[in-house]
């Protein structure tokens, strides 16, 4: 019998490399059974995760999973950092793994590094 616990499927030690000025959607995959839990996003500041208030969020439904989406419209250099989603389920808090946004502040599209260049940067791989 499948567990009816809420599960948040953000991959452990995942990251996204994005560019300032672009729109970006950060997705929190949520598995639940009967009632969709209340889900929030927070941004890590040291060991504290600061709840993101007043941000544009939405839900997307797929076959076996729902996604709670945090919208960046557009991405700002200050959005660099690690994020976590958490769900309120039966008065318990379930926390996801954190996922990291690496924001590149580029002046124009012609200056954008390729994905290979991004992948070869030690600061990107080991921050």
């Amino acid at each position: 019998k499948e567990s009816c616990d809420v599960q948040l499927y953000i991959k452990r030690q995942s990251y996204h490399s994005i560019f300032a000025g672009d729109p970006f959607k950060l997705e929190c995959p949520v598995k639940y059974c009967a009632h969709r839990p209340q889900v929030t996003w927070c941004k890590l500041n040291g060991t504290t995760c600061v709840k993101l208030e007043g941000r544009h969020t939405s839900w997307k439904q797929e076959k076996n999973l729902s996604f709670f989406i945090l919208h960046f419209e557009p991405v700002l250099p200050s959005d660099n950092g690690s994020y976590r989603c958490s769900a309120n389920f039966l008065s318990a808090i379930i926390e996801s793994h954190s996922t990291t946004l690496y924001v590149t502040d580029v002046k124009s599209a012609s200056e954008r590094p390729s994905k290979d260049e991004m992948a070869s940067r030690p600061w990107l791989l080991y921050s």
């Epitope: 991959k11 030690q13 990251y15 994905k115």
Partner: antibody, heavy 120, light 112 residues
Framework: EVQLQQSGAELVKPGASVKLSCTDS????????IHWVTQRPQQGLEWIGR????????RYDPKFQGKATITSDTSSNTAYLQLSSLTSEDTAVYYC?????????????WGQGTSVTVSS | DVVMTQSPLTLSLTIGQPASISCKSS???????????LNWFLQRPGQSPKRLIY???KLDSGVPDRFTGSGSGTDFTLKISRVEAEDLGVYYC?????????FGGGTKLEIK
């Protein structure tokens, strides 16, 4: 049983490149990470790196940076390892392995390995 | 990099004897999520590695309960209560906490 099927053995000349493949027949690779591990003759296991097929982002052991390039194609559920500027030191068996994701995050399923021999 | 040091290099045992393999890491393997991503693999001759134990002490399905994993922080142990012929091969510890991921050098179990 979930299987990772790797491409066949390769005999390549020094200085050449080779691209190995790893196809997951039972699991959507977008949902996890695919790792590559190497084993030189009579030696232990060494981690090369991993890819997140959902977005193509990679992490490598710095000692393989520039030598190995990991890519994936989610339409065919396949991950690839390209090895460049091959030398006799690159003669080894190369394994792909799948990380099983939530909640254990370990290498639960391995391919059968691809033998690469670098020889003139 | 996190260095994983296994000992002994070789174990030569008779059927029914107990076995103990040590794995020490150069840094703590306790992750920020409170879990310790220390795993044990067995590579039988001519085969791919096979996962035996994950998260220090959890046995993979199909692994006999004569295998036990223990430890925390930087010191870990794999024990076999009574060695059987099918246990021969090379045992590797592997850490999945830090990048780059690293394996121990391996411990070869021979049956006398």
């Amino acid at each position: 049983e979930v299987q990772l099927q790797q491409s066949g053995a390769e005999l390549v000349k020094p200085g050449a490149s080779v691209k190995l493949s790893c196809t997951d027949s039972g699991f959507n690779i977008k949902d996890t990470y695919i790792h590559w591990v190497t084993q030189r003759p009579q030696q232990g296991l060494e981690w090369i790196g991993r890819i997140d097929p959902a977005n193509g982002f990679t992490r490598y052991d710095p000692k393989f940076q520039g030598k190995a390039t990991i890519t994936s194609d989610t339409s065919s559920n396949t991950a690839y390892l390209q090895l460049s500027s091959l030398t006799s030191e690159d003669t080894a068996v190369y394994y792909c392995a799948r990380e099983d994701g939530y909640p254990y995050y370990t290498l639960d399923c391995w391919g059968q390995g691809t033998s690469v021999t670098v020889s003139s | 990099d996190v260095v994983m040091t296994q000992s002994p290099l070789t174990l030569s045992l008779t059927i029914g004897q107990p076995a103990s393999i040590s794995c020490k890491s150069s840094q703590s393997l306790l992750d920020v999520d409170g879990k310790t991503y220390l795993n044990w693999f067995l590579q039988r001759p001519g085969q791919s590695p096979k996962r035996l134990i994950y998260l220090v002490s959890k046995l993979d399905s199909g692994v006999p309960d004569r295998f036990t994993g223990s430890g925390s922080g930087t010191d870990f142990t794999l024990k076999i209560s009574r060695v059987e012929a099918e246990d021969l091969g090379v045992y590797y510890c592997w850490q999945g906490t830090h990048f780059p991921r690293t394996f121990g050098g391996g411990t070869k179990l021979e049956i006398k």
